[in-house]
Amino acid sequence: YDFTNCDFEKIKAAYLSTISKDLITYMSGTKSTEFNNTVSCSNRPHCLTEIQSLTFNPTAGCASLAKEMFAMKTKAALAIWCPGYSETQINATQAMKKARKSKVTTNKCLEQVSQLQGLWRRFNRPLLKQQGSSDYKDDDDKHHHHHH
């Protein structure tokens, strides 16, 4: 799915109002020094691509994130604010139903959610190369590249 045409401001609002708090709840009791972020993103569509992948794709050692409250709210936000997103997720939903029913919080899952928090931070505030207007508002994202 191409996230270019999503309403980024609305997704950001949804994240800040509820999803962020659910992520914090999930991570409660974890030391803030425990995990280093290794996944990064360069603009808002790219961030959403990475967020979707980490949230909904089962990984080795962490198969159950899609059933968490933050994941369900993320899915709802993307379905509402990204045109055509719901239609692309039918197969993914079937796969999700086949996933394990129980919710198991492993260290790998905690690490993955820490990565998610980092991706959402960059979604909320991409650190973009300064070009002309040098802003990071939604419509300009797709025209900028990460600065090195």
């Epitope: 800040l16 803030s32 995990f35 972020n37 980092g118 979604f123 505030r125 990460h146 600065h147």
Partner: antibody
Framework: EVQLVQSGAEVKKPGSSVKVSCKAS????????IEWVRQAPGQGLEWIGV????????NYNENFKGRATLTADKSTSTAYMELSSLRSEDTAVYYC????????????WGQGTTVTVSS | DIVMTQSPDSLAVSLGERATINCKAS??????VTWYQQKPGQSPKLLIY???NHYTGVPDRFSGSGSGTDFTFTISSLQAEDVAVYYC?????????FGQGTKLEIK
Amino acid sequence: EVQLVQSGAEVKKPGSSVKVSCKASGYAFSNYLIEWVRQAPGQGLEWIGVIDPGNGDTNYNENFKGRATLTADKSTSTAYMELSSLRSEDTAVYYCAREDNTGTAFDYWGQGTTVTVSS
Amino acid sequence: DIVMTQSPDSLAVSLGERATINCKASQSVSSDVTWYQQKPGQSPKLLIYYVSNHYTGVPDRFSGSGSGTDFTFTISSLQAEDVAVYYCQQHHRFPLTFGQGTKLEIK
């Protein structure tokens, strides 16, 4: 406990450079942006720039472009702000600050470093 | 650059009374506004982020509202420890910019 501890006060001559350090502790240094803000005596807050310690990416206020250089050393969890070609108007308290968990604010601030530029 | 203009520059309010500070952006900043408190000789402290969200541990008497270009920060019942300078900040576009500050005193 998250802490940002800055280097001590500096007195500099016009035309010289100053390098202020900001040592972070209590969190994963690479995961959060570090912002730099200054405050001239009796004045408001002015944003200098931001660095991503994870990869060194930066963004500068155009007012400081070419004079300010932001760097970060992951091995010591320390961020640096160097300002060159100092003039008397650069006399200010310089703060480092960390972005919050949502990326929308600065939640932890250093104690500030006073830089005085005088001949 | 986006200019953030606060009003008034200074404000004197009686203990227990309401204090209101306004912040106007020179162009729309959506909801990307933060409020900080700075006491003399101290670093700024985060109070409100994304217009109206309380930072951890910030008392309920502090609140924020608004969207687009007009924003309001309110202390519902002024306490002695609230004497400080308050700043709004936009993080909608680079460069990030602050209001000039509003000095709040007790009447």
